[in-house]
Structures are given as C-alpha cells and as structure tokens.
C-alpha cells in the first residue's frame, strides 16, 4: 500500500519463521489481535499474538517448526490474516497472499570472531544462521567498521557480492579500538531485504613496534 500509516508487512527467514509487523493509525490499544497463517499446500496452520512495539505498531513471529527445519519452499503461498477480537468474534483487519521466497529477511550473522589481527589489518570471520540450503552460494554481505569518534551511520559499507564468510580489514590504525558488524541478503526475492546487523564485534589492532615506521 502506498499509504504508509497502515501496513501489514511480513518476512520469511528462509527456514521456520515468518515475522510480521502490523501498523495501523487509530487502532485500539487494548484490542487482542493475532496473525493467522494458512499455507496453500501444507497441512499445518499457525497463529501468533500481535504485541505492541510502538504506539501504532504491533509485531509477532510465526514459529513454523524447529529453527533449522525447512518448512516452506519457493512454490508455497501462505495466506496471512490480521484478526482482531470484537466482542465474541474475530474480525479480519488485513490480508495478504505471502510468497515466502519473495519476502526474505535472514537472521543476523552470528559467531563473529577475530581470526588474525595485526597493526594495520584484521581478519574476521562469521557464520550465517538458519539460512536455507536452497540458496547454495547465492548470498551477499555488507560489512561496516566503527572507527573511534564516528557513528555507525558514518561508517562506509563494504560489499561482498558472494557467499564469503570472512573479511580482511586493511589500512587500520595501530593500537586502536574498532567495532565490526555484518549483515546478509539472499539474491532471490522481489521484496527481499537485508538481515539485521550482527552483534558488534570489538577488536583492537596491535601497537606499532617501537622505533619502526608505521
């Protein structure tokens, strides 16, 4: 919908979770609402309770199974409805046909670690979490490094246009504290978006050796 005040947006993490946000100006704060998922070719259906995340926005996670189980495929369509209680009955507030692999947002990368650090460079690795085997190598990453005296928003983005779960940061300043974050995105999906940023990894470059050029 073009109207930004009222939206029902959901993303699939590629395995067993559909996360939804429902925003609605003027909606009643104390009304009980839920998201109901009905797949077109599966025997299960699932419901989650919408909980407030701001004054006019609610969110919930449809847990479809064990975290690493592949619950949906590229041919699945899931009808998602927002239902709110009105007295003794439930009223449909919003509806959409959700194509999971057109609306992907993966989990943030995990297990960030410093593989090797020197005075001017640092090699960092990470892992992707709960990502479908369907992607094979069709993933890309963005990374950013927080330098002293700067904000994350000012940090330049480094783009890795392939499934590469490591990076070598160069031209760093010796004996300096940095933080590093990475996020991931599948190449598939018309409405696919970047994962959240990973938890920041703090590291410090080695001090320059005394009496040597830096």
């Amino acid at each position: 919908a073009v109207n930004g005040t009222s939206q029902f947006t959901c993303f699939y993490n590629s395995r067993a979770n559909i996360s939804c946000v429902w925003s609605q100006d003027g909606a009643l704060q104390d009304t009980s609402c839920q998201v109901h998922a009905w797949p077109d070719r599966r025997r299960w259906n699932q419901t989650c309770e919408l909980l407030p995340v701001s004054q006019a926005s609610w969110a919930c996670n449809l847990i479809l199974g064990a975290p690493d189980s592949q619950k949906l495929t590229t041919v699945d369509i899931v009808t998602l409805r927002v239902l709110c209680r009105e007295g003794v009955r439930w009223r449909v507030m919003a509806i959409q046909d959700f194509k999971p692999f057109e609306n992907l947002r993966l989990m943030a990368p995990i297990s960030l670690q410093v593989v090797h650090v020197e005075t001017h460079r640092c090699n960092i690795s990470w892992e992707i979490s709960q990502a479908s085997h369907y992607f094979e190598r069709h993933l890309e990453f963005e990374a950013r490094t927080l330098s002293p005296g700067h904000t994350w928003e000012e940090a330049p983005l480094l783009t890795l246009k392939q499934k590469q779960e490591w990076i070598c940061l160069e031209t760093l300043t010796p004996d300096t504290q940095y933080e590093f974050q990475v996020r991931v995105k599948p190449l598939q999906g018309e409405f696919t978006t970047w994962s959240p940023w990973s938890q920041p990894l703090a590291f410090r470059t080695k001090p320059a050796a005394l009496g040597k050029d830096t």
Partner: nanobody, 123 residues
Framework: EVQLVESGGGLVQVGDSLRLSCAAS????????MGWFRQAPGKEREFVAV????????VYADSVKGRFTISRDNAKNTVYLDMSSLKPDDTAVYYC????????????????WGKGTLVTVSS
C-alpha cells in the same frame, strides 16, 4: 501502476441478481489484493469484499455476507462481484480497488481505484 475499469452496473428490482466486473491491468496485478467498495448517495464509501489474487482467499463485510460473492479469473485479469437478493440498501456506486505491496494493514485503504459503476435497486 494498476488500471481498473468496472462494468455491469444498472437498474434492477429488489431480489434480483447482478454481476459486476473489474478489468485490471498493470505490472503488479498478479500480486495484488482486489476489492469492491460502494458509496451510497450522501454516505461514506464502505468496504464490500476483498480477494487475494494468488489463492483467492476472501473477506466480506457483514452486510453482504451470504448474498455477494467475490471471485477472480487470473487468465483474464478480471475480478467479479456476484450480487444476489439485492435490496434497496445496496443502491450505490460500486468501486473496484487494488492494494499492492507493501500491503495495507486496513481493508479500507487501497492503492488504486476505478471510476465506479452505478447499481440501482428499485422496489
């Protein structure tokens, strides 16, 4: 952009049936929610029914449940509203509308609208 053109309106008697059609065109039609709304003279526009394009899932206003049926023909890019047991209260201009991604959180809010077709139910 989605273009919508309604047809099928006219003058009918109480208890009669009528079929409205909405021809849709545009790049995003295949993933849209398609709805029918109506506006009676001197009243606000109200939601009648909506259908999802891919699975054909439907939602109806209480006032038309059991009397009106919304359907779609994907091959023809057309949405229909079959109206039966018509009452004088059903007299209104009927509008076809489309909701495209990101989807609306409110059945009354749509992105694209047709110009409408008049249905008059006389007693």
């Amino acid at each position: 952009e989605v273009q919508l053109v309604e047809s099928g309106g006219g003058l009918v008697q109480v208890g009669d049936s009528l079929r409205l059609s909405c021809a849709a065109s545009g790049r995003t039609v295949g993933s849209a929610n398609m709805g029918w709304f109506r506006q009676a003279p001197g009243k606000e526009r109200e939601f009648v029914a909506v259908i999802t394009w891919s699975t054909g899932s439907t939602v109806y206003a209480d006032s038309v449940k059991g009397r009106f049926t919304i359907s779609r023909d994907n091959a023809k890019n057309t949405v229909y509203l079959d109206m039966s047991s018509l009452k004088p209260d059903d007299t209104a201009v009927y509008y076809c509308a489309a909701d495209v991604y990101p989807y609306s959180g409110n059945l009354n809010i749509m992105d694209y609208w047709g110009k409408g077709t008049l249905v008059t139910v006389s007693s």
